[in-house]
């Protein structure tokens, strides 16, 4: 029986050219996390496997950094980074948990007014 829940940063906005941390947290379960996939719509951004560690897609290597923890840091943001991001937690013995984050990348002047959505 799956008892866990995924908490995410939810809907966030960030400034063009800036950085943002995509963070998911699995709680209310003692299941072992065997792998986390970070996906953006139809693309695999990164995988963190308990046995193999991190692997980042070459397409994003210059702009994506692993961590903190099982999160993902996106750098040098562009408007094209706007969209849905998914953290997919594969666990033993529970199975799979999925979290969703919507990121909106704004032009600098607009982002200043939406600063309340920024991650410190």
């Amino acid at each position: 029986m799956m008892t866990g829940t995924i908490e995410t940063t939810g809907n966030i906005s960030a400034e063009k050219g800036g950085s943002i941390i995509l963070q998911c947290h699995l709680s209310s379960t003692t299941a072992q996390v065997t792998q986390v996939n970070w996906e953006q719509q139809d693309q695999l951004l990164a995988i963190c496997n308990a046995d193999l560690g991190w692997h980042i897609s070459p397409s994003f290597k210059d702009r994506v950094a692993p961590g903190p923890g099982l999160g993902l840091t996106l750098q040098s943001l562009t408007v094209n980074d706007t969209g849905e991001y998914f953290c997919i937690y594969h666990t033993y013995p529970d199975g799979t948990y999925t979290g969703r984050i919507f990121l909106e990348v704004l032009e600098s002047s607009v982002a200043e007014h939406g600063a309340r959505f920024q991650i410190p």
Epitope: T34, I47, A50, L52, H90, T96
Partner: nanobody, 115 residues
């Protein structure tokens, strides 16, 4: 018992192609990957494919190697083109199976690229 069986290795001339296969018996996987280890070197990650057919490659092989899956046969392939002598190594597949604690590794298949 879950097993991975690799095949398709062999001797090929530089510039040639090979297709490796990795057949998984028994269980469904949510990620399968290919790795290689040359003599005296560390194991190197090459490519991984998820159960949703999303792929991720190492810089060293992107554009030359292609990972794909036949879910009906529970088999993952590595198509290797434009092979170079430095691609000579033992190639291993690994699978993260659903509801399993750790990766399962295949026994490896030798690939030798002659100049």
């Amino acid at each position: 018992e879950v097993q991975l069986v690799e095949s398709g290795g062999g001797l090929v001339q530089a510039g040639g192609s090979l297709r490796l296969s990795c057949a998984a018996s028994g269980r469904t996987y949510y990620a399968m990957g290919w790795f290689r280890q040359a003599p005296g070197k560390e194991r190197e990650f090459l490519a991984i494919i998820t159960d949703g057919s999303k792929t991720l490659y190492a810089d060293s092989v992107k554009g030359r190697f292609t990972i794909s899956a036949d879910n009906a046969k529970n088999t993952v392939y590595l198509q290797m083109n434009s092979l170079k002598p430095e691609d000579t190594a033992v190639y291993y597949c690994a699978a993260q199976f659903t509801l399993a604690r750790h990766l399962v590794w295949g026994q490896g298949t030798q690939v030798t690229v002659s100049s």
